[in-house]
Amino acid sequence: KSPIFGPEEVNSVEGNSVSITCYYPPTSVNRHTRKYWCRQGARGGCITLISSEGYVSSKYAGRANLTNFPENGTFVVNIAQLSQDDSGRYKCGLGINSRGLSFDVSLEVSQGPGLLNDTKVYTVDLGRTVTINCPFKTENAQKRKSLYKQIGLYPVLVIDSSGYVNPNYTGRIRLDIQGTGQLLFSVVINQLRLSDAGQYLCQAGDDSNSNKKNADLQVLKPEPELVYEDLRGSVTFHCALGPEVANVAKFLCRQSSGENCDVVVNTLGKRAPAFEGRILLNPQDKDGSFSVVITGLRKEDAGRYLCGAHSDGQLQEGSPIQAWQLFVNEESTIPRSPTVVKGVAGGSVAVLCPYNRKESKSIKYWCLWEGAQNGRCPLLVDSEGWVKAQYEGRLSLLEEPGNGTFTVILNQLTSRDAGFYWCLTNGDTLWRTTVEIKIIEGEPNLKVPGNVTAVLGETLKVPCHFPCKFSSYEKYWCKWNNTGCQALPSQDEGPSKAFVNCDENSRLVSLTLNLVTRADEGWYWCGVKQGHFYGETAAVYVAVEERKAAGSRDVSLAKADAAPDEKVLDSGFREIENKAIQDPRLFAEEKAVADTRDQADGSRASVDSGSSEEQGGSSR
């Protein structure tokens, strides 16, 4: 017998989607061999409709996909927009169609529900609203109107025009009698429950001349939308529950065992600790829709997610809900990158951010995740030359090393810089990555003076002391501006005396500014790098003043001024939230906006919060 297993029968209705999972023994050969879905012909052949090697038959174009999950030993065939023509016998299998590694599946697609024997069929999603219309004749216009539910053999009164409401429907049902012109009454039931499903009878009048109408109410649990994302990638759940719940608390929960659905995030401020630093709930639109972005997908994030609306901010009976089945593909296109970067107070970090290498021209961004309320991520810097005011002189986004990675350097670290940061671009929204910066005990490796004052027209020499651990690194000085840090000539002055227990390999490298002008005022960085990979940096602010006495200035560590206090956060923050995260085009439009730049998109990037890799701040 074949080791392949799957559903023997699949029954659905026209217009629906099916998701057929086939299980195979996850041997290394099986994991990487061709997977296929084929239709069995009358003469015994099996015609491929879709395969893991990219083939899609014209019959399935635009409505089917096949996804392999090698680590689980499964592959999934999704087929949308079913028609009765899709009914038939199929095989899901491995290798070549004619060989034995396959499983037979019978797919039966029937007509959708409609009117059956004068019974109106109402098919409504769980938690939503149904309106059951009940016509009557003129002679019953003044008589009692009622709705019954068939429970077993007996009709049970649900509501009537005299004011009775069955306790199971209290607070969520009403009976409306239309104006005199219309011979119709309607019963509106809100917050539909699964238990509301069944046969109903509406009646006008109570005698033999009464008008009766049958209704069949089908309450559907939402069909989970299948979502496939890469490990370390990002997923966005768009939740549209309708305007009737616009003012009700929203939630996203992840189903655990049994009927439990553990809140991941809600609009009442709750957030699961496992998602700290890697989740944003975007404020809802007027129509009540909202979205949740999760970055740094981990293997354990896979599962069934429900979003819904309820005053408690969690799943309750009668909550309107949407459902997703998230699969996390471990054969990820998103490379591993450090999830934790450590730096010391006064020191620096260099963060490597992956992006989709096919989108080298995309705009790169870096933002600081804030957990307040539902989470947000105000932008700090972009690759187009914008830097948030309070980060001037200590933050730079560099396109290097390129080819799928950019670098963000942050120096003059304080304890307030500890937290979660997101790397993202205005291109592929699946490539959002998160990195946590931790501030640890220790001294910065590079030693520079504090603030330095240069004199117009004179020469200024600024020292930077590199310990011996950086002997093999390239050492540089550069002048910071909001588009990067432009390299400047520097002089190696030989071994440094600034380090105890450090041999001849330590270095003193000086920056010399000849004939200082006003344009020389600003931030200067010294740093180390290896090729296009950056390590530690240290920053010095050079102020320029009028000449007081002749001569050149040579600054030592001791003479340096104290570093200025950190600037207060500017009010014109740009952040990833609201519609921006849902619409990458907002990025493109934003360039036309004045420099307050209040809004930006959370376009797609990713994070490996799932790995324990760490990167030190001092070197790569």
Epitope: E9, V10, L220, K221
Partner: nanobody
């Protein structure tokens, strides 16, 4: 909590038929699959059949040993699952357990199911 109550077991002759029912009550909001497992004396509990659903789509899974003889079905309105057993064999003798749960993964795996019934005994004599 979800409660499962099985019925329909009994003593039959080889070749006969039997229909098992499993009624679910309680909060079944996130139950997307119900199935049958069986345990013969001195043996491990084994998968028989499962029905999973998603909206108006049903997926039916069977163990090789019962294919073509057993049929699983459900009545959505009654929250009940049935196992129609035809052409019964003495080796089908076992306690049959109804199981329910989210069943996100392989329906043959016991821990995919969150709730279990008490079991109903099926004895097939030769």
């Amino acid at each position: 909590e979800v409660q499962l109550v099985e019925s329909g077991g009994g003593l039959v002759q080889a070749g006969d038929s039997l229909r098992l029912s499993c009624a679910a009550s309680g909060r079944t909001l996130t139950t997307y699959g119900m199935g049958w497992f069986r345990q013969a004396p001195g043996k491990e509990r084994e998968f028989v059949a499962t029905i999973k659903w998603s909206g108006s789509t049903n997926y039916k899974y069977y163990a090789d040993s019962v294919k073509g003889r057993f049929t699983i079905s459900r009545d959505n309105a009654k929250n009940t699952v049935y196992l129609q057993m035809n052409s019964l064999k003495p080796e089908d003798t076992a306690v049959y357990y109804c199981a329910a749960g989210t069943v996100l993964g392989d329906p043959r795996v016991l821990n995919e199911y969150d709730y279990w019934g008490q079991g109903t005994l099926v004895t097939v004599s030769s």
